[in-house]
Structure formats: C-alpha cells, structure tokens
C-alpha cells in the first residue's frame, strides 16, 4: 500500500491547514514522469499551455517543472499535534508564471497564468513513497490526488487506503 | 509532547534474535514515517531501516536486508524492529525516529533515547 | 547509493568564533540534507532541514548553506553548549549519514 492512512480522516484538517510561510521553504527543478515512465510534457497550444502524458522519443528533452516545497500547519485542536502537525506543500510551475492547478468541478488539471500570492487551488500535499515517488493530494479537496486517465493528468479521488497504491496517482521526480 | 520510547535492547548471543520495540505518544502516529538509525560504540549515525504511515512500504540497509524486518502497529502507536542472525557488527544503540512532516519521508524531526543491543558471545 | 563526506572530522575553536562545517556529496542531492547535532550521551537533535531551515527552537547563530554537492553548517558565534558532534544527512535519494564532525573549545 502507498504511504498515505485514513485519508478521509484528514479532510477538516486539510482544508484548516494553513501555509506558515509566504516564501518556499526550497524549490527543486525536475522532470515529472508517472508511475510506468511516462513523461509529464507542457505544450503551448493557442495561448494557452496543454498537458500530455506520452512516452518521449529516444533523445528527446523532459520538461522541467519548478517545484516550490512550502510548510503548512496543522491547527493544533485538529490534529492533536500542536505544532508538529506539519505537512509539505508543493506547487508546481512548468514555466514561468504558470502553476498546475486543480479544477474540482471538472476533476481535471490545468495551467493557469496568474500572480502571486497562489490561489488554494495551485498547493498539492506531498505524500511520498520515498524521495523520488510523490503524491499530489489537493489542498482545496482532501482524498483527491492528481493522477493519469487517458493519458491526460486528472483528479482522483481516492476513497480508501487499499487505493492508495495505485500507480495512476504516483510520480517520479528526477533531475534528467 | 512528542515522546518515543524504546525497549528491548539487551545482551545477545550471535546468531540470536531480539525484537525492539518503540512507544510513541503526544501526535498522530498513523500520520509519519518511522525509522530506525543505529549508532556503534563510539561510531556515527548509520540509517537502518524505514516504514511508510500505513506500514505498506519497508526499506531496509543492505547489511541487514533479509535479517531485520520493521512493522508497526497503527492502533497501538509502535513500531517494531524484528532482528534476527545477529551479528558482532549489529552492536550498537539503536533510536527510534519519527519523520519531520506528515506522509513524508523527509527528516528526522524527533528522536527517542535509543536502546542498546549488544551482541557477544 | 550516495556517499556524505564531512570535513573536518575534528575542529577546534575559541568561544565567540565563527565556525563551519562541510559536507559533500557523491551526487547532487537538491538540498535534500539536514543537520543533526549529538551531544555525549543524548540522542541527536535535528538543527536544520531542507538545507537551511531553522528547526524549531534553535539558535539562530546556527545555519545552513549550499547546494548541488557542497553543503555547510555555520555557527557564527561559539558557545560552550554547542560542544558536540555535528552530522549532516541526504535523504535525496535512500537515507545516508555523513561520519560526523566533533566540534570542541580550545
């Protein structure tokens, strides 16, 4: 099972949680690519970015994003943890001024342009299976994870623990 | 306030097996990874083993792999070390670590006081 | 599997100096690295994190610098308590422990 429990529990918490810090506690260049070594690419279609999952060519570059790892709080009356309730935020930028973000009301994942400070919408929760294999849990919607469907990124919503170890919700992070 | 507290250390014969135990209390446990670090006589900090929050992943050094064997219990907020073919080379104190952040493997954000394991004929 | 290499393995220094303490990597390791501060007969203390992240509750003549391969810890100013041995740590990919530096009043 992947490295996340009781996901439901959480949800108040995590929409409570609050990010201590206006600046990035580090930010970490990297490619993103799934679970079965697919590349996460950025395509500038129409003004606008478009995001495809797709298995790259032999030497063709991987996309870099810009990933900004910020503190978030725990209330201390929620998790019972006083100030050791910390989670890792994340956002994701792929170029410059543009942020993934997650739209609920379409389940999907998109590139917005906008300033900061970042809207709810551009944080994702780290969850980690270890350094190099991530989760990205919505801020704005507790137990929904960014994931691959139809070779697209999506949200999924993750129910239970037992479907926590789906690779359709786990990332590699590499710096080639 | 944070408190993990081990168990189980003591005088062993090669070959032999030992579990230890850590007790953790004041924050969720079911939320961090724990961890195992050891520290020979004398020595620095060698990292031993590690386990997801809910138990699902495990991650061992390569001198132990195969001999150690971490676990936890959720609802009763342990983790365990199973030691089995102890070595001369396994002696040491032995710390129970929680990581810095929920669901992350990231840092050692609190540590217990550590029990030792000694391991003579 | 990545290798830490701190230097030097013992460093003595006046109260008041400023010290540092370096740690290289085999790999870059995105300033995925912490410090651990042990003194004799206590269990290590996280200092630092992320490479230049303050724990909660530590001096503030204690920071942390770097990236890549090259890391440092610096104590700007001296004091008597800060007698112990320093570890940095990778978790960038798998977990490793530097061998320590012992930090010592002349």
């Known amino acids: 099972a992947f490295g996340i429990s009781g996901v439901q529990k959480y949800t108040r918490a995590l929409h409570d949680s609050s990010i201590t810090g206006i600046s990035p506690i580090t930010e970490y260049l990297a490619s993103l690519s799934t679970y079965n070594d697919q590349s996460i690419t950025f395509a500038l279609e129409d003004e606008s970015y478009e995001i495809y999952v797709e298995d790259l060519k032999k030497d063709e570059k991987k996309d870099k994003v810009l990933l900004s790892y910020y503190e978030s709080q725990h209330p201390s009356n929620e998790s019972g943890d006083g100030v050791d309730g910390k989670m890792l935020m994340v956002t994701l930028s792929p170029t410059k001024d543009f942020w993934l973000h997650a739209n609920n009301k379409e389940h999907s994942v998109e590139l917005h342009k906008c300033e900061k400070p970042l809207p709810d919408q551009a944080f994702f929760v780290l969850h980690n299976m270890h350094s190099n294999c991530v989760s990205f849990e919505c801020k704005t919607d507790p137990g929904v994870f960014i994931g691959v469907k139809d070779n697209h990124l999506a949200l999924i919503k993750v129910d239970s623990s037992e479907n926590l170890c789906t690779e359709n919700i786990l990332f590699k992070l590499s710096e080639t | 306030e944070v408190q993990l507290v081990e168990t189980g250390g003591g005088l062993v014969q090669p070959g032999r097996s030992l579990k230890l135990s850590c007790v953790a209390s004041?924050?969720?446990?079911?939320?961090?990874?724990m961890y195992w670090i050891r520290q020979a006589p004398g020595m620095g900090l060698e990292w031993v083993s590690s386990?997801?929050?809910?138990?699902?992943?495990?991650y061992y050094l390569d001198s132990v792999k195969g001999r150690f064997t971490i676990s936890r219990n959720n609802a009763e907020n342990t983790v365990y070390l199973q030691m089995n073919s102890l070595r001369s080379e396994d002696t040491a104190t032995y710390y129970c670590?929680?990581?810095?952040?929920?669901?992350?493997?990231?840092?050692?954000?609190?540590w217990g006081q550590g029990t030792l394991v000694t391991v003579s004929s | 599997d990545i290798q830490m290499t701190q230097s030097p393995s013992v460093l003595s220094a006046s109260v008041g100096d400023r010290v540092t303490l370096s740690c290289k990597a085999s790999?870059?390791?995105?300033?995925?690295l912490d410090w651990y501060q042990q003194k004799v007969g206590e269990a290590p203390k996280l200092l630092i994190y992320?490479?230049?992240n303050l724990q909660t509750g530590i001096p503030s003549r204690f920071s942390g610098s770097g990236s890549g391969t090259d890391y440092t810890l610096t104590i700007s100013s001296l004091q008597p308590e800060d007698v112990a041995t320093y570890f940095c740590?990778?978790?960038?990919?798998?977990?490793?422990f530097g061998q320590g530096t012992k930090v010592e009043i002349k």
């Open positions: 670590a929680r990581g810095h952040y929920y669901y992350s493997s990231y840092s050692f954000g609190s």
């Open positions: 004041g924050f969720t446990f079911s939320n961090y990874w």
């Open positions: 386990i997801n929050n809910d138990g699902g992943n495990t």
């Open positions: 790999h870059n390791i995105n300033k995925h």
């Open positions: 992320f490479t230049n």
């Open positions: 740590f990778q978790y960038n990919s798998g977990w490793t």
